[in-house]
Interface confidence: medium
């Protein structure tokens, strides 16, 4: 029986040109996490494999950074980044858990308000 639950960053907004952190956490299960996939609609953004580490899809490598933790940082946001993002936890023996985040990227009202930052 799957007992786990995923908590996520939730529905979020960001400004064009800024950065945003997407984070999920799987709790209430003792299942072993073998891999976490990050997807935007039907596109694979990144994979974090327990044995092999991170793989960022080539088409996103300039704008996606791994972390914090199993999360993902999106940089240089564009309005086209608006949409649903999914953290997909592959676990043993439970199976797959999926968390959903909706991101809305807004036109910058004041240029310096775009939140730019780095993940150390």
């Amino acid at each position: 029986m799957m007992t786990g639950t995923i908590e996520t960053t939730g529905n979020i907004s960001a400004e064009k040109g800024g950065s945003i952190i997407l984070q999920c956490h799987l709790s209430s299960t003792t299942a072993q996490v073998t891999q976490v996939n990050w997807e935007q609609q039907d596109q694979l953004l990144a994979i974090c494999n327990a044995d092999l580490g991170w793989h960022i899809s080539p088409s996103f490598k300039d704008r996606v950074a791994p972390g914090p933790g199993l999360g993902l940082t999106l940089q240089s946001l564009t309005v086209n980044d608006t949409g649903e993002y999914f953290c997909i936890y592959h676990t043993y023996p439970d199976g797959t858990y999926t968390g959903r985040i909706f991101l809305e990227v807004l036109e910058s009202s004041v240029a310096e308000h775009g939140a730019r930052f780095q993940i150390p």
């Epitope: 996520t8 960053t9 939730g10 979020i12 400004e15 997407l22 984070q23 939140a115 930052f117």
Partner: nanobody, 114 residues
């Protein structure tokens, strides 16, 4: 109007402690995520720690074991307890919500110096 107000900074000696607070107001609902960032002079703003509404936390490697982030959802307030402070922790500390989007507050200056 959505506002984030940081407080609690100051001058502290190496090895000392400070507790920063971030009061959030103007939200129609409690943020799902609160985070602390910092910006040292001449450097880019960097993520320090974050907490989900349910209490799960993440920390940058540089502060792990020394800093503790927490949130009081009933008060829409986030905290950063900073122990064993080092000179390299000197920076303006900012809090933000929901993944690092605006609004950024004015920040609170933490200076670690003997």
């Amino acid at each position: 109007e959505v506002q984030l107000v940081e407080s609690g900074g100051g001058l502290v000696q190496p090895g000392g402690s400070l507790r920063l607070s971030c009061a959030a107001s103007g939200f129609t609902f409690s943020p799902s995520w609160m985070g602390w960032f910092r910006q040292a002079p001449g450097k880019e703003r960097e993520w320090v720690a974050s907490v989900l509404r349910g209490g799960y936390t993440w920390y940058a490697d540089s502060v792990k074991g020394r800093f503790t982030i927490s949130a009081d959802n009933s008060k829409n307030t986030a905290y950063l307890q900073m122990n064993s402070l080092k000179p390299e922790d000197t920076a303006v500390y900012y809090c933000t919500r929901d993944g690092g989007f605006d609004p950024w507050g004015q920040g609170t200056l933490v200076t670690v110096s003997s």
